[in-house]
């Protein structure tokens, strides 16, 4: 997974929204204790911004040491800074914790760019604005890192919420959420509402701002509008899903749907951008360029290098298209679509040199590791990671940024055939899965 602008085929699969509506499966499940309703103590427990990650306050050790921890659905280790680092305000001091237990084992996590390494142990962990429980969890105490911590991000560690298969050093290291569910009565589900500000935040504003909510063990109805639509988790490693169709302003990209998921498609709160496989990225940019051709943007804008600016308050949102991703539904031959606005994929950036203008960075980028639905996508939606039922739910977020003419949307059902063929089967090798 990546926090900055980080971290073989079949043809013609229809997937057209034929206007044909399938009989509606009840996507609202019957009430279950602990799974539904209000989670007031957890609402607004995230801070941060899409460019540098969203973090939750956690405590580790006895007496408790408070740290801000990046919420990352694209990895599976709970890892915290445990030694001085120029970008850290504070770090976990194991020697001060009476409940720390050393596992006498090291861990090394390389990324394509950068790495972190540390020492494994366990300690007592709780989330002050989360469920009222304390769990003994595995902790990687980071002693050395490169291109991992971000200057000014205000977080000191990472909470990997994905599955054990991608945990380091191997899948025997139980991830935090597994420990939480095993040791408590917290249901095996969490949900995320990431709230993009829609305008740039300076450091003091970020510290004061609300970034969203991580609801542990349930779903809070106040955080979304409309219905929740669910897509199956294809395989429990990353939160892998299957995209069956992509549209730009309603125009199908008309690619073999395997391309959209080459070599996988994941939902990753630890990545800033919507990242697309090379061929898909090129087709999407071509289509977005064509739709917004009333203005000529520099090549560097599409690369994420150049900002584009407009006089304050005059951003021409209407010239930019909406982007729809169709996801495999829970019912055979049924899909649904999630639609994001330019308010999600143009990321506001503050630059003193151009402070009189509203400036933006293009937050869709190329990937060599498949589609990554990062904060750009997640900021439009309330996303339910229903691990118990092996599915991910999407509903329109109550905090998404939009204008008077268009809003993000989650709509369905649509008839889509042969969706299973859209998944790419990664050849099994011994290669690291985390080398993203």
């Amino acid at each position: 997974t990546q926090h900055g602008i980080r971290l073989p085929l079949r043809s013609g699969l229809g997937g057209a929204p034929l206007g044909l509506r399938l009989p509606r499966e009840t996507d609202e499940e019957p009430e279950e204790p602990g799974r539904r309703g209000s989670f007031v103590e957890m609402v607004d427990n995230l801070r941060g911004k899409s460019g540098q990650g969203y973090y939750v306050e956690m405590t580790v050790g006895s007496p408790p040491q408070t740290l801000n921890i990046l919420v990352d659905t694209g990895s599976s280790n709970f890892a915290v800074g445990a030694a001085p680092h120029p970008f850290l305000h504070r770090y976990y001091q194991r020697q001060l914790s009476s409940t720390y237990r050393d596992l006498r084992k090291g861990v090394y996590v390389p990324y394509t760019q950068g790495k972190w390494e540390g020492e494994l142990g366990t300690d007592l962990v709780s989330i002050p604005h989360g469920p009222n429980v304390t769990v003994r969890a595995n902790i990687a105490a980071i002693t050395e890192s490169d291109k991992f911590f971000i200057n000014g991000s205000n977080w000191e560690g990472i909470l990997g919420l994905a599955y054990a298969e991608i945990a380091r050093p191997d899948d025997s290291l139980e991830p935090f959420f597994d420990s939480l569910v095993k040791q408590t009565h917290v249901p095996n589900l969490f949900s995320l509402q990431l709230c993009g500000a829609g305008f740039p935040l300076n450091q003091s504003e970020v510290l004061a701002s609300v970034g969203g909510s991580m609801i542990i063990g349930g779903i809070d109805h106040s955080l979304y509008t409309g219905s929740l639509w669910y897509t199956p988790i294809r395989r429990e490693w990353y939160y892998e899903v299957i995209i069956v169709r992509v549209e730009i302003n309603g125009q199908d990209l008309k690619m073999d749907c395997k391309e959209y998921n080459y070599d996988k498609s994941i939902v990753d709160s630890g990545t800033t951008n919507l990242r697309l496989p090379k061929k898909v990225f090129e087709a999407a940019v071509k289509s977005i360029k064509a739709a917004s051709s009333t203005e000529k943007f520099p090549d560097g804008f599409w690369l994420g290098e150049q900002l584009v600016c407009w006089q304050a308050g005059t951003t021409p949102w209407n010239i930019f298209p909406v982007i729809s991703l169709y996801l495999m539904g829970e019912v055979t031959n049924q899909s649904f679509r999630i639609t994001i606005l330019p308010q999600q994929y143009l990321r506001p950036v503050e630059d003193v040199a151009t402070s009189q203008d509203d400036c933006y960075k293009f937050a869709i980028s190329q990937s060599s590791t498949g589609t990554v639905m990062g904060a750009v996508i997640m900021e439009g939606f309330y996303v339910v990671f229903d691990r118990a039922r092996k599915r991910i739910g999407f509903a329109v977020s109550a905090c998404h940024v939009h204008d008077e003419f268009r809003t993000a949307a989650v709509e369905g059902p649509f008839v889509t055939l042969d969706m299973e063929d859209c998944g790419y089967n990664i050849p099994q090798t011994d290669e690291s899965t985390l080398m993203t």
């Epitope: 900055g4 602008i5 980080r6 460019g51 540098q52 394509t112 760019q113 291109k147 971000i150 200057n151 000014g152 203005e295 000529k296 943007f297 520099p298 090549d299 560097g300 994420g304 290098e305 150049q306 900002l307 584009v308 600016c309 950036v349 630059d351 040199a353 151009t354 400036c359």
Partner: antibody, heavy 116, light 107 residues
Framework: EVQLQQSGAELVRPGTSVKLSCKAS????????MHWVKQRPGQGLEWIGM????????KNNQKFKGKATLTVDTSSSTAYMQLISLTSEDSAVYYC?????????WGQGTLVTVSA | DILMTQSQKFMSTSVGDRVSVTCKAS??????VAWYQQISGQSPKPLIY???HRYSGVPDRFTGSGSGTDFTLTISNVQSEDLVEFFC?????????FGGGTKLEIK
Amino acid sequence: EVQLQQSGAELVRPGTSVKLSCKASGYTFNNYWMHWVKQRPGQGLEWIGMIDPSDDDIKNNQKFKGKATLTVDTSSSTAYMQLISLTSEDSAVYYCARSGVALPYWGQGTLVTVSA
Amino acid sequence: DILMTQSQKFMSTSVGDRVSVTCKASQNVGRNVAWYQQISGQSPKPLIYSASHRYSGVPDRFTGSGSGTDFTLTISNVQSEDLVEFFCQQYNSYPYTFGGGTKLEIK
């Protein structure tokens, strides 16, 4: 306040190499590409290339391929440019400049003099 | 590569005058042009981006205009500190290219 502090002047022999540095402060280093620009005495400006500190992605001017190598060290928020096989044609002031809209921030420049 | 041509290497003007420095691109660059001012021995100072937007802190006597291939930097009420060199730059496509520069001199 955004600042780009470049290393001091260099007097180097033909055929050798030199590594220039540009230390950034006042912004999140990973968020912006860093560019390098050449200016020969009394002449115009030439764009050498740029690097994305978040993932080391590089875009070079073909003219400087094999001459300039761009790198970064994110832990010290520093960009580097190494120039190899130096000749008198490489005698110039070299600037680092940060992305934004065009190039809104420039370092003070490093004078490289290639002389036997 | 896109060629940026500043046809006048030197321009004569007087303090208080209005002067226009021109720049021509060899192909359409939209409005993706910047202007820089350079005092001898110093680094370029950004003045204008997106053809006509002033960077923060740039005096309003500097005005940029143009789109496509023809661009102009106009300095009204020229001050003595403006008698330096001005460069245009296109950032529409890679490699980024600069004009050869225009030096303002006293008449």
